[in-house]
Amino acid sequence: AVDLTLLANLRLTDPQRFFLTCVSGEAGAGRGSDAWGPPLLLEKDDRIVRTPPGPPLRLARNGSHQVTLRGFSKPSDLVGVFSCVGGAGARRTRVIYVHNSPGAHLLPDKVTHTVNKGDTAVLSARVHKEKQTDVIWKSNGSYFYTLDWHEAQDGRFLLQLPNVQPPSSGIYSATYLEASPLGSAFFRLIVRGCGAGRWGPGCTKECPGCLHGGVCHDHDGECVCPPGFTGTRCEQACREGRFGQSCQEQCPGISGCRGLTFCLPDPYGCSCGSGWRGSQCQEACAPGHFGADCRLQCQCQNGGTCDRFSGCVCPSGWHGVHCEKSDRIPQILNMASELEFNLETMPRINCAAAGNPFPVRGSIELRKPDGTVLLSTKAIVEPEKTTAEFEVPRLVLADSGFWECRVSTSGGQDSRRFKVNVKVPPVPLAAPRLLTKQSRQLVVSPLVSFSGDGPISTVRLHYRPQDSTMDWSTIVVDPSENVTLMNLRPKTGYSVRVQLSRPGEGGEGAWGPPTLMTTDCPEPLLQPWLEGWHVEGTDRLRVSWSLPLVPGPLVGDGFLLRLWDGTRGQERRENVSSPQARTALLTGLTPGTHYQLDVQLYHCTLLGPASPPAHVLLPPSGPPAPRHLHAQALSDSEIQLTWKHPEALPGPISKYVVEVQVAGGAGDPLWIDVDRPEETSTIIRGLNASTRYLFRMRASIQGLGDWSNTVEESTLGNGLQAEGPVQESRAAEEGLDQ
C-alpha cells in the first residue's frame, strides 16, 4: 500500500488550532512533475457534507512529502469529510478523514467501520442531545433509512447493514429530522472486496495474517499496518511517537501522538495512534491493553509486562507476542520485512538465526512462493548467531510474493515471512522530446513515460549523427532536468535515445526508441527598426520597417511581427514570409487597446534580435457596459437577471449578450443572445440545481461593447438555509447534506 498518512489534530478547544497534515513516505512524493509523481493534495470534500462558506483554508507545504491545512475559524468549518491524495500513477491513493462535531445531537460510537464482503455492518449513533423526532440515515448524502425516536436502544440508534458489498462503502450519516446536518453523526464504511482473510481477483489468495490490528488489502494482499506498527505482517512495534510504514515519521509536539487521529489508505480507515483511545484520542490505554485505539490485549506470559505502545516486553530468556516462546527455541533474527530486486538478477539473501542448540548451515532453509526450497551455499557462524547465505537463481516476475526463512533444530523451529518485490527495469515508451535547437546545440527533455518500475535513479542520453557507424556519445543526467547536447554540427540530424535505470543491481533498462533531432541553421544577426505605422480602422494597423545594409546575401527567410497586449496578457504574432517585405497590414485587432509592437528577422526556426519596440493605441469602439447587473434564483433550474441600459449610447442597441459560467468550472462559458434590446431582465433556464453560476453581459451596436460587472448566484436546492425538507426530485432521493 502507499505510505500515506492523514493526521487530524483533535484538540478542539479552539478551532483555530485545529490542523490536518498529510504525510507521504513515498520516494519522490509531492515533487510535482507529472513524470516523477504528482503533488500531494489535501482538501475538504464538499460533495456530501456541505458547510456554510467561510474564509478559505490555508494550505502549507513542508518540503516535498508533507502538506498541512489550517485556517479553520469556527467549529462548523471542521465538520465533514477531508481527503488527502498521494502516490503516482496506478498507486495514486486517497485517504479520507471524517470529522464529527463534539457538540452534535448524535455522535458515532465508532467512526470508521472496516468489514469484509458479505459481513453485517452495524453503525451505532449515540444520543448526545435528545430530540423527539425521526432519525434519518443517509448514505453518501442520499436518503437511506428512517427510525422513529422510540427505536433508540440504550440511547443509541442502530443501522444494520446485512450482507454488505463493496458498493455499500461510503459516508453514512444519522440526523434528527429538522436538525442542522452539522449535528449529524458521520460514519465511514469500508467494505473490503473479499471475504475475511482473502485477497486478489476472485478472492482466491490467502492474506498473510496481519498482526496488531493490521488490515489485509483486498487488491495486493499487503497488510496496511496501524500507526505505530511496521513489517510485512505488522509484527514490529515502532518506538513511541513514531508512525509510517518504516516508523520514519514522528508525531509533532511534546505529548507525542496524544490527540491525533491517524487515517491510512483503505481498507484501514482511521484510528488513534498506538497507546491512545477515545473520541479525541486523548485517553491512554487501560492496563493490559495496547495498540491503536487500545484495541489489543497483551495477555503476557512468563513475567512479561504490558507496554501500551508495543505490547508485551519479555524478560530475558523469552520472546514471542505473549512471551510464550523460550529462547532455547531457535529464532530468526533481524529479517527485513521487505526486499526488492530487479528482474533477471541473481541476488544473495542472508538469513540469521540463534538458539540452543546452535543452528548450523543445514538447519536454515529458504522457501520461495512456489514452494521451491533453497539450501544455503555458505554460513557465517558467530558467537551469538548463524547467518546463512542463499544464492538465488535468476529472478522472474513470478518470484514476487512472500518468501519464508525457516530454521529447525532439536529445540524447535521458527520461521519468518518476508516480501520479495521483483521489479522490472524501466524502458522508455517514447523518444525524448526536443525543446529548443540552435546551430550547434540541442536542448532535450529526457522525461518520458516508461514501462516497468520506478523510481528512476539515472537517465542516460545516447546520441550520434544520423546514419553514422561511429560509437554513441553518452551523457548521464539528473532525472528531473533538461539536457543540453553541445558542440554539435550545424544543420545535422542526430539520432537520440534514452536509457533509464532504477536503483539496485541490474536496474538498467533497455534503450528506448530513437528520434531524429536536427540542429538549426545559422542565426540571423541583423536587427530591423520600425519606420512607422498608421491606424487604418479601429482594428487595423499598417506597419513598415527597415534593415541595415550589409554586404553579401541576406541571412533570413522572413519577418515576425509581435503585438503585445499588456492589459490582457496576450501576444499576437504575424508571420511575413518574404525577406524582401518591408510593410504589413495587421487586421482583427482589439479596438481601444494599447499594443507594444516589434519586428524580428527569422531564419529557419531561429529569430534574430528584435527591433526597438513601438507603442500603438487603437481607437475604441462598441457601447459602454450595461449597469447594475443583478441575479436572483427563482428555482432549482432558473435564475433571473436584471440590469439597466448603458449610459451615453452612440446609437440604438441591437442585442445583449449574456455569458454564463459554472463557478470554479473548467469548461467554456455559454453565450446567450437577448434579442429584444428594450428588455432589462431575462430568465436563464435549464440550469443545474444547487450550483453556483457566474454571469456578465454586454451590449452590441455595430460591434460588441464592454462587459458588465460579474455577478454570482446559486440555483435553489437542499441548502443550509432551507427551513424545511429538501426538494423531492432526483436531487432529493440523492440529495446532499447541506
Partner: antibody, heavy 120, light 107 residues
C-alpha cells in the same frame, strides 16, 4: 418507477374482518415508511396508519386504534392492514402510500386504491 | 390532535385566472405542510411539501407559501386540467391530519 398495488378489498358485514395487502416495486421497500390513507364516499382524505421501515414502530388514527393493525414483510415487499370489528363508517377507498425519501415530507407515491364496503 | 381547516369549500375560477386556497392549522406546524390534488377515480397527487417546495414534475404555476398556522396554495393561471379537490395535510405530529378539502371548479 415506484408502483403500489392494493388488493384484498370487498364487501364485509359489520363486526367482520378483512386484510388488505399492498405489493410494492420500483424502490427499496425495506428502507421507507409506509402508510394507509382512506376516503369515505363523498368525504375527504383521512390518514389511517403509518409504519416505520423496521416494522417496530406504528401509529394509528384514533378512529381505528385497537381495531386495525398495520404490518409489513420486507422480504416480500408487502404492506398489510388487518381490519377487525369493522363498522359501516369504515366503508372507504383505502390507499397504500409511500412517504418522500426525506421521511417526514408528505406522501409522495400512492396506489390506485381498493374499495372496502361494510354493510349488512 | 392538530385540526386543519381549509377555505373556501368551493372555488369557481375561469381558465387563465389566479386561484388562491387557504389552510389554517389549530397550532403551529412550522413548515411541515403538504398540498395534494385529488381527482375522481385517481390516486391523490403530491403538489407541494415543506409548505413551499414543489414536488417533482409539478408545473411552476403551483406555488405554496406560509409557515406556522397560516398557509396558501396559489395557482397563478388556472388550466382546465387543474380542476379537482385540493387537500392540505400537516406532518408535524401524529396523528397526521388532512383539511376537509377545497373543490376547484372551472367557471
Amino acid at each position: 418507477e415506484v408502483q403500489l398495488l392494493e388488493s384484498g378489498g370487498g364487501l364485509v358485514q359489520p363486526g367482520g374482518s378483512l386484510r388488505l395487502s399492498c405489493a410494492a416495486s420500483g424502490f427499496t421497500f425495506s428502507r421507507y415508511r409506509m402508510a394507509w390513507v382512506r376516503q369515505a364516499p363523498g368525504k375527504g382524505l383521512e390518514w389511517v396508519s403509518s409504519i416505520y421501515p423496521s416494522g417496530g414502530v406504528t401509529y394509528y388514527a384514533d378512529s381505528v386504534k385497537g381495531r386495525f393493525t398495520i404490518s409489513r414483510d420486507n422480504s416480500k415487499n408487502t404492506l398489510y392492514l388487518q381490519m377487525n370489528s369493522l363498522r359501516a363508517e369504515d366503508t372507504a377507498v383505502y390507499y397504500c402510500a409511500r412517504d418522500l425519501s426525506i421521511a417526514a415530507a408528505g406522501t409522495a407515491y400512492w396506489g390506485q386504491g381498493t374499495l372496502v364496503t361494510v354493510s349488512s | 390532535d392538530i385540526q386543519m381547516t381549509q377555505s373556501p369549500a368551493t372555488l369557481s375560477v375561469s381558465p387563465g385566472e389566479r386561484a388562491t386556497l387557504s389552510c389554517r392549522a389549530s397550532q403551529s406546524v412550522s413548515s411541515n405542510l403538504a398540498w395534494y390534488q385529488h381527482k375522481p377515480g385517481q390516486a391523490p397527487r403530491l403538489l407541494i411539501y415543506g409548505a413551499s417546495i414543489r414536488a417533482t414534475g409539478i408545473p411552476a404555476r403551483f406555488s405554496g407559501s406560509g409557515s406556522g398556522t397560516e398557509f396558501t396554495l396559489t395557482i397563478s393561471s388556472l388550466q382546465s386540467e387543474d380542476f379537482g379537490v385540493y387537500y392540505c395535510q400537516q406532518y408535524k405530529d401524529w396523528p397526521r391530519t388532512f383539511g376537509q378539502g377545497t373543490k376547484v371548479e372551472i367557471k
